[in-house]
Interface confidence: medium
């Protein structure tokens, strides 16, 4: 709330609390305030102040306890390396400004691990990974000295320990003590020193959280050998007889606020979607809490592994549910998780020791009642027999991730709760709920899933091509004949699927321009592959001027596409990717996919059209039930088809039909939409079922789409289920896993 519009309900005056170069906002109904500075600046000497019972704001004290009269926004600096072992870094400076670079160099006989060059980022952190100069002489590799920390201990033999410290006023995140373990890995996780103004950027959180989560979800055999000194990646076998429980724990206390609560729910919906995209089906537990916890989904419920059902339960939770009891009792919430984990009569069921448990806690800060929640984490570790047997510590069977949101987060508390694992991060502090939402959108979109088909970045900051990342624009330049515009869809790293009629046999590759991702540059074409049965003049003798059967073509690109948020493939029918996208069992057949995507009824679908330089989705219905016949018969109104006796002469079984006014008035395609995908949107994924081919009525005569169109304005699309053998043959090297 802007301070001018909100007066604290407590008795603290707002006089003189301003910050030079920034602003402030009130929190907790005026009982606290947060200083806000522009990007690249931080509030000095404190970020938050509390309204004391005496009616005054907490004093402005520096890290060395000096009192300051007025708060100010100061430029963010990155910490300097206190120490760097076995090498040098340049340049040396007492502090570094945003965008300053440093480089690391090892002495002879030492090899550099991590990032040789690092840049000071706008959040006060260095880019890249800790630079370490190591000669491989220890049993464990040198654990390094993260910039800003000090390390005590330089022996790396089995069971040797090193400890880390931060300068005064900074909080240590990660492990203060790390021990060299059997197998050559270090216990715990790399530490870092955090200032109160430091937040993790959404990109950092998405990358770190996902790389840790995928370690948990997508593991390979844990028995892989590794020699001493090797960096050991955590590897977990997804034992078919084992399982995974994910407990989502959401703070619903007063200080969170209704909009933040809704934002957190969105994040968790995205997380469930993400996990489902990996093809695993964990059981979910769902807890919200304030003074008391409320269990919405128990892992023992039959539907707890049904991602759609869990998402539905999550969406139905109301912030008001905790309104009357709005403290923050994190301990009780974790006890609710413990109760879900424990066994009736304390008798462990068969396979209990193969179940992995992931706790994801989202909170805006301080537990203010119920005692220290860390004791419950210890009880959970005991229950799961974690950390008891040195030979088999079972650390892989529990992951506790903590997301702290906002300025009031107590970094020490959240760090204590989170798991600490080598090369992984389990504790995150983000600026606000908007940033956390960014995390989960980015997470859905991280590089490991870039090859996942039919995924989009449905985000408020998304561009047209974030929302339609498969969409390709095609134009064919014909000297003295102007140019033809079409659409297409990225189906793999080398291929774009479009309509054959966009091209003539005379078109040369260099005259075909293809662009994707909204990029200005055109892609180089290697070849255009037509369906062998396509022949536009095939029925001229029969008085049919243009015949569009098998109107499909694949454009093969010279260079591999680099997938990203604005360039990624759409799903094709009868591929493994589509099986996963639809969350169908791996044994699903092509026929079963067809029944799922094209049942005998009106099917809600969409196509993408460009209007006034913007891509827009147009919702249509594929007439595949009782309206199919009448839809197809309207083809007789198409120019040149009026003399066709039997409409099946032009509307072959290869076509899908949309348009008309029933069940709803469908928008129609325009000439420039040809070749674009006809899409079914299911389970947050996009599957192409057709290629836009031809229309009965030109509804876009004067570059403008007509509003009033006749009921017989129908569009015809090549049904991809009907051209699968050709697709399978041409795309056989594209790793799409055709069924």
């Amino acid at each position: 709330t802007p301070w001018s519009l909100a007066r604290p309900q407590g008795s603290c005056s707002l006089e003189g609390v301003e910050i030079k170069g920034g602003s402030f906002r009130l929190l907790q109904e005026g009982q606290a305030l947060e200083y806000v500075c522009p990007s690249g600046f931080y509030p000095y000497p404190v970020q938050t102040r509390t309204c004391r019972s005496t009616g005054s704001w907490s004093t402005l004290k520096t890290q060395d306890q000096k009192t300051v009269r007025k708060a100010e926004c100061r430029a963010i600096h990155c910490p300097r390396p206190h120490d760097f072992e076995n090498g040098e870094y340049w340049p040396r400076s007492p502090y570094y400004n945003v965008s300053d670079e440093i480089s690391f160099h090892c002495y002879d006989g030492y090899t550099l691990r991590g990032s040789a060059n690092r840049t000071c980022q706008v959040n006060g952190r260095w880019s890249g990974q800790t630079a370490i100069c190591d000669n491989g002489a220890g049993y464990c590799s040198n654990p390094g000295i993260p910039i800003g920390t000090r390390k005590v201990g330089s022996q790396y033999r089995l069971e040797d320990s090193v400890t880390y410290h931060c300068s005064r006023g900074l909080t240590l995140r990660g492990s203060q003590r790390r021990t060299c373990q059997e197998g050559g890995s270090w216990s715990g996780t790399e530490p870092s020193c955090q200032d109160s103004f430091m937040y993790d950027t959404p990109q950092e959180v998405a990358e770190a959280f996902l790389s840790s989560l995928t370690e948990t979800i997508e593991g390979v055999d844990a028995e892989d050998g590794h020699g001493p000194g090797e960096q050991q990646k955590r590897k977990i076998v997804l034992d078919p007889s084992g399982s995974m429980n994910i407990y989502l724990v959401l703070d619903g206390s007063d200080s969170i606020g209704a909009s933040n609560f809704t934002g957190a729910k969105k994040c968790l919906v995205n997380l469930i979607e993400k996990v489902a995209s990996y093809g695993v089906k964990p059981r979910y537990g769902l807890v919200t809490y304030a003074t008391y916890p409320k269990i919405w989904v128990k892992v023992s419920e039959a539907d707890s592994s049904n991602a759609d059902w869990v998402t539905k339960q999550l969406n139905e939770i109301n912030y008001e549910d905790h309104k009357l009891k709005s403290g923050t009792n994190t301990k009780k919430a974790l006890q609710a998780v413990y109760s879900m984990m424990s066994w009736p009569d304390d008798v462990p069921p068969e396979g209990w020791n193969r179940t992995r448990h992931v706790i994801i806690l989202m909170t805006d800060g301080l537990h203010n009642m119920g005692g220290d929640p860390i004791t419950v984490i210890d009880e959970i570790r005991d229950l799961l027999y974690i950390g008891k047997d040195r030979k088999n510590p079972r650390e892989d069977y529990l992951d506790v991730y903590v997301f702290g949101v906002g300025p009031l987060v107590n970094q020490v508390n959240i760090n204590a709760l989170a798991s600490k694992k080598d090369n992984e991060q389990h504790v995150f502090k983000v600026k606000d709920m908007e940033n956390l939402e960014d995390v989960f959108y980015q997470m859905i979109d991280e590089s490991q899933s870039l090859s996942l088909c039919g995924m989009v970045w449905e985000h408020r900051k998304g561009t047209d091509y974030h929302k339609q990342p498969w969409q390709a624009k095609i134009s064919v330049i014909r000297p003295s004949k102007g140019h033809e515009s079409c659409m297409g869809a990225v189906v793999s790293e080398y291929f774009v699927l479009t309509a054959a009629h966009c091209f003539t046999v005379d078109d040369k590759e260099h005259s075909i321009k293809v662009s994707v991702g909204g990029e200005k540059r055109d892609l180089e074409i290697e070849v255009v592959l037509f369906h062998p049965n396509y022949n536009i003049n095939g029925k001229k003798e029969a008085g049919i001027p243009e015949f569009y059967d098998y109107d499909v073509a694949l454009i093969k690109l010279k260079n591999k596409l680099k997938y990203g948020q604005t360039i990624r493939p759409i799903c094709l029918p009868c591929t493994e990717g589509t099986t996963r996208a639809l969350r169908l069992p791996p044994t699903t057949t092509c026929q079963q996919q067809k029944e799922e995507l094209l049942p005998a009824q009106d099917i809600k679908a969409l196509f993408v059209s460009e209007e006034e330089k913007k891509l827009t989705r147009k919702e249509v219905y594929i007439k595949n039930g009782d309206k199919k016949g009448s839809c197809e018969r309207d083809a007789q109104y198409a120019p040149g088809y009026d003399k066709v006796k039997d409409i099946s002469e032009v509307v072959t079984p290869r076509f899908l039909c949309t348009g008309g006014v029933s069940p709803y008035a469908d928008p129609n395609t325009c000439r420039g939409d040809s070749g674009g995908p006809l899409i079914v949107h299911k389970r947050s994924r996009f599957i192409q079922v057709g290629v836009i081919s031809w229309g009965v009525v030109d509804v876009c005569k004067n570059q403008k789409r007509q509003k009033q169109v006749p009921a017989h304005a129908r569009d015809f699309h090549i049904n991809l289920f009907q051209v699968l053998p050709w697709l399978k043959e041409k795309l056989q090297d594209e790793d799409l896993g055709f069924l």
Epitope: F84, W90, P91, R92, S93, E101, S103, H105, A116, N117
Partner: antibody, heavy 120, light 113 residues
Framework: QVQLVQSGAEVKKPGASVKVSCKAS????????MTWVRQAPGQGLEWMGW????????KYAQKFQGRVTMTRDTSISTAYMELSRLRSDDTAVYYC?????????????WGQGTLVTVSS | DIVMTQSPDSLAVSLGERATINCKSS????????????LAWYQQKPGQPPKLLIY???TRESGVPDRFSGSGSGTDFTLTISSLQAEDVAVYYC?????????FGQGTKLEIK
């Protein structure tokens, strides 16, 4: 062998700008920072700043901030130093120099120098 | 900024004699964790660019005759030429790289007596 060859002498009027080039050969241009140092007649050496030819990132001495611009053209392995709003006390020999590794501060290789004279 | 002060400003020494040039920094150039001093010495002859002689305060650059040596630690450093040769006539500069901006001493002019 490593060679840094600078552009020829320049005479400029006060208020004008000068752009000195430094062409590198005998090593991978983008692997080493290029530093610029100047020396007024009969005076000592003064560090002006550097450019990372790989990223284009620069670091300038506070004294020259706002007046100096360091750029590079990796296609021809050449670094440039442009100094604007010239004053008579900018009359100096300008050197480019390269360290041992990355952005090492020990300048083992130097250009021959470019004399810039600022005079009305 | 770290200020580097050399003494003397100029020095005349007979051929074959020892020459000693001092350099004092306004703050310590010693990095305790590596026990290294961030100081270099350069030689500059008329009409030529400077030439690196010594780095890390005492490490001789390859190809530099062993009559040149560097010593000192913290804030006080010395460049010694054990037996002056005619080709050693030049201006000598110390330079700190402990902190940005990197700064040079004002130079010491060495001549033959």
């Amino acid at each position: 062998q490593v060679q840094l060859v600078q552009s020829g002498a320049e005479v400029k009027k006060p208020g004008a700008s000068v752009k000195v080039s430094c062409k590198a050969s005998g090593y991978s241009f983008t692997d080493y920072y290029m530093t610029w140092v100047r020396q007024a007649p009969g005076q000592g050496l003064e560090w002006m700043g550097w450019i990372n030819p790989n990223s284009g990132g620069t670091k300038y001495a506070q004294k020259f901030q706002g007046r100096v611009t360091m750029t590079r053209d990796t296609s021809i392995s050449t670094a440039y130093m442009e100094l604007s709003r010239l004053r008579s006390d900018d009359t100096a020999v300008y050197y480019c120099a390269r360290g041992y590794y990355a952005n090492s501060a020990w300048f083992a290789y130097w250009g021959q120098g470019t004399l810039v004279t600022v005079s009305s | 900024d770290i200020v580097m002060t050399q003494s003397p400003d100029s020095l005349a020494v007979s051929l074959g004699e020892r020459a000693t040039i001092n350099c004092k920094s306004s703050q310590s150039l010693l990095q305790s964790s590596t026990s290294k001093n961030y100081l270099a010495w350069y030689q500059q002859k008329p009409g030529q660019p400077p030439k690196l002689l010594i780095y890390w305060a005492s490490t001789r650059e390859s190809g530099v005759p062993d009559r040149f040596s560097g010593s000192g630690s913290g804030t006080d450093f010395t460049l010694t030429i054990s037996s002056l040769q005619a080709e050693d006539v030049a201006v000598y500069y110390c330079k700190q790289v402990y902190n940005l901006p990197w700064t040079f001493g004002q130079g010491t002019k060495l001549e033959i007596k």
